[in-house]
């Protein structure tokens, strides 16, 4: 299953499959997730070790048992790959690292005014993988405001150095934010020239393209089909690059297929997994396990659930079957691709779905009336769980925010439905940033069911929580995916990095905003919050957030939207924007419904499939 917990001051002993330099544990975890063999990782921050060569070291590890012995190491951070973690799987990494220089091949230098501009340049450059920016206070005047675009053979820095007034980060191409755009075309009977960066076996050109997309240095590819004249080169997928970023030449060639990486696509990237099943094909590799199962789909599920399994073959040979069940061969290799592909067999083969973002249909959990005042504009994909709840009567308008928590589920505030309980009037927009982008052709979700907490009463602040079941499930993308819910009764976690988002008023007597706003707000203890509200009871089912001096807060139109906190590199939905005394008033924190206190209710309502246990929409 999905294991998200991090282990502080711990280092996994043995099992090394790769090592690299990464700026933090979260990036190390992401590299582990995308490495075909990595199940566990250990990271050494600069503060944890004196050996300069091992600082920022990220060690990727494998283990037959799925675990390794942990040894105490002060400052070290260890954890698990996020394979099998559904929508949490993403190669997108937005963080900017201050005081850190990520080294690599510097291939472009320009003057820019901010680190954000530098990151944008990197994202819009086909070869740039990461960058460093010298701030205006950098000690050498001639380097100030320099933006260095970089790459390396492995896509990660060749070294990372602590350096004042330097800021570094990664390209946002994996966030589907590149302005370059991509070539979706597949070119039949055409071979590209240039430098081969890797060679793998794939059953078709589409798998080859997805592998190219997620390979750090692949810009385009050529695939040799299973009828290619040279037998030893059949099903070979050649991942390629060039100085210019495009093929310098192409040759007409029977039984070859060529195409481009889709990493520069804007708004949609392919999933980092291959779901197709190939009948009459055997995939060869190292045997992990053999099990009897009923049908090829069950074989794929079995492979997906066994975290080390990379691909499988389901044999229909009479000697491999008994009754309705046949042998399911679970396999792996060094690079995650079959070591041999055979056609015309009595088997069916395919890949593990452990890296698919879709995950299962349930809500996301983890093991462990009120624009934003004083906020700033959000950027694409920054808050992919944020939805806009809009009402269409004569005109259409934004009324509330909400949070996507599953393919078919949105969590919001109950008071959003005060006086508007009819599901037909509501339209739910997801994966949007600007309300002005919504036209009559913009797709929206309709409501199948509104489930208001049974103890909620109109015009009262208690139990201000509601679930919306959508008529049709949503697909996950970099711009539309769920937020994880906290653990039940999560009281021990101290959240220090919390944000509220929404399109609500920018002042008490204001208007709905066009661009999704964000504001960083500290949590306030319930005891402190209670003292600020002389005539309202702040219960343990509420959480408060705000600045003593005011100035930053949620406001009208933000209701129902998320209060999210980042902990151990993972965002969690801590609160639902509920109520407050005015907006951003001095000494008056905003009050949010505490999601952890409603976990039983959320899980009960989202998991009761027959609907009998679900509360009906209010009449």
């Amino acid at each position: 299953g999905c294991l998200t917990q991090l282990y502080e001051n711990a280092f996994f002993r043995g099992g090394d499959v790769a090592s690299m330099y990464t700026p933090n544990a979260q990036y190390c975890q992401m590299r582990c997730t995308f490495h075909p063999r990595c199940l566990l990782f250990s990271f050494l921050p600069a503060s944890s070790i004196n050996d300069m060569e091992k600082r920022f070291g990220c060690f990727l590890k494998d283990s037959v048992t799925g675990t390794l012995p942990k040894v105490h190491r002060t400052g070290a951070v260890s954890g698990h790959s996020l394979k099998q973690c559904g929508h949490q799987i993403s190669a997108c990494h937005r963080d900017i690292y201050k005081g850190v220089d990520m080294r690599g091949v510097n291939f472009n230098v320009s003057k820019v005014s901010s680190v954000e501009e530098c990151q944008k340049r990197c994202t819009s450059n086909i070869r740039c993988q990461f960058f460093s920016y010298a701030t205006q206070t950098f000690h050498k005047a001639e380097y100030r405001n320099n933006c260095l675009l970089k790459y390396s053979p492995g896509g990660t820095p060749t070294a990372i150095k602590v350096l004042s007034n330097v800021e570094s980060g990664f390209s946002l191409k994996p966030c589907a934010l590149s302005e370059i755009g991509c070539h979706m075309n597949i070119f039949q009977h055409l071979a590209f020239s240039d430098v081969d960066v890797a060679r793998v076996l794939t059953p078709d050109a589409f798998v080859c393209r997805t592998i190219c997309t997620y390979h750090p240095n692949c810009l385009f590819f050529t695939f040799y089909t299973n009828v290619w004249k040279i037998e030893s080169q059949r099903n070979v997928c050649l991942l390629k690059t060039s100085e210019s970023g495009t093929p310098s030449s192409s040759t007409p060639q029977e039984n070859t297929i060529s195409g481009y990486s889709l990493l520069t696509c804007k708004r949609t990237l392919p999933e980092p997994c291959h779901s197709k099943i190939y009948p009459g094909v055997d995939f060869g590799g190292e045997e992990l396990n053999v099990t009897f199962v009923k049908g090829v789909n069950v074989c794929q599920e079995t492979c997906t659930k066994m975290i080390r399994c990379q691909f499988f073959t389901y044999s229909l040979l009479p000697e491999d079957c008994k009754e309705e069940k046949c042998k399911c061969f679970l396999r792996l290799s060094m690079d995650g691709s079959p070591t041999r592909i055979a056609y015309g067999t009595q088997g069916s083969s395919g890949y593990s779905l452990r890296l698919c973002n879709t995950g299962d249909n349930s809500v996301c959990t983890t093991k462990t009336s009120t624009r934003i005042v004083g906020g700033t504009n959000s950027s694409w994909g920054e808050w992919p769980w944020q939805v806009s709840l809009q009402v269409k009567l004569t005109a259409q308008r934004h009324l509330c925010g909400g949070s996507l928590i599953g393919h078919q589920w949105v969590l919001t505030a109950a008071h959003c439905f005060d006086g508007l309980p009819l599901q037909d009037v509501w339209r739910i927009y997801s994966g949007i940033l600007n309300l002005s982008d919504i036209t009559k052709d913009t797709p929206f979700s309709q409501i199948k069911e509104i489930i208001i907490h049974q103890n909620y009463k109109v015009s009262e602040g208690n139990h201000d929580i509601a679930l919306i079941k959508l008529q049709a499930p949503l697909n996950y993308t970099e711009f539309q995916k769920p937020i994880c819910l906290p653990s039940k009764g999560d009281t021990s976690t101290i959240y220090t990095n919390c944000w509220v988002t929404g399109w609500g008023f920018s002042k008490e007597k204001g208007e709905i905003q066009n661009i999704l706003q964000k504001v960083n707000i500290p949590l306030v203890t319930n005891e402190e919050c209670q003292k600020r509200y002389q005539d309202y009871k702040i219960t343990q089912r509420m959480v408060c957030a705000g600045y003593k001096e005011g100035g930053k807060d949620a406001c009208k139109g933000d209701s129902g939207g998320p209060l999210v906190c980042k902990h151990n590199g993972m965002w969690r939905l801590v609160g639902i924007t509920s109520w407050g005394e005015g907006c951003a008033r001095r000494e008056q924190p905003g009050v949010y419904t505490k999601v952890a206190e409603y976990m039983d209710w959320i899980l009960e309502k989202t998991q009761s499939s027959d609907g009998k246990a679900q509360m009906q929409s209010p009449a």
Epitope: K531, Y533, Q534, K537, T539
Partner: antibody, heavy 116, light 106 residues
């Protein structure tokens, strides 16, 4: 409109107990804290204790900890104060009040006279 | 326990006057002070909370200020209905009332 209706005046003997009630209208007691306070003749206001009717949690002024008991029945939307071992010093007007952090709406008071 | 010393215990004033009442806490109460008006036969009425915030529907002639241990409450332009007893209440640590100030017509 928020109102808190308190029970009628009581005359009780020293050493006896008294149980006062407070029935609000216009709100649900479980959505607020309920306070009990008192004012002795020609004296200031004193805080006796507070209850969270939703869960029954109480906080008392240490001076009343052993003799006072605050309860609430959410089904009848009523809060109660019982004071035991009464002496003449307990002669006072007893108030219930709705509160968040502080009492914000008060009842009209119940006069309790302790007299032999 | 936090003690609240309220002064004066009584004062006489005329209609239209401005009066000020003070409360001194035995320790810093972080601005968590409220002021109440009490008239005979009625329950007290909340006027001000958190030092200077007017409770709903309270006229602006009532005001409060202070910090640390020292706080004051004022009524400007006294009106007939303002003659009553006034109490301060600290709520930084549990709840303690001041002794009260009786405001009478001169």
């Amino acid at each position: 409109e928020v109102q808190l209706q308190q029970s009628g005046a009581e005359v009780v003997r020293p050493g006896a107990s008294v149980k006062l009630s407070c029935k609000p209208s216009g709100f649900n007691i479980k959505d607020y804290y309920m306070f009990w306070l008192r004012q002795r003749p020609d004296q200031g206001l004193e805080w006796i204790g507070r209850i969270d009717p939703e869960n029954g949690n109480t906080v008392y002024d240490p001076r009343f900890q052993d003799r006072a008991s605050i309860t609430a029945v959410t089904s009848s939307n009523t809060a109660f104060l019982q004071v035991n071992s009464l002496t003449s010093e307990d002669t006072a007007v007893y108030y219930c009040a709705r509160a968040g952090s502080i009492p914000s709406y008060w009842g009209q008071g119940t006069l309790v006279t302790v007299s032999a | 326990d936090i003690q609240m010393t309220q002064s004066p215990s009584s004062l006489s004033a005329s209609l239209g006057d401005k009066i000020t009442i003070t409360c001194k806490a035995s320790q810093d109460i972080n601005k968590y002070i409220a002021w109440y008006q009490h008239k005979p036969g009625k329950g007290p009425r909340l006027l001000i909370h958190y030092t200077s915030s007017l409770h709903q529907d309270i006229p602006s002639r009532f005001s409060g200020s202070g910090s640390g241990r020292d706080y004051s409450f004022s009524i400007s332009n006294l009106e007939p209905e303002d003659f009553a007893i006034y109490y301060c209440l600290q709520y930084d640590d549990l709840w303690t009332f001041g002794g009260g100030t009786k405001v009478e017509i001169k």
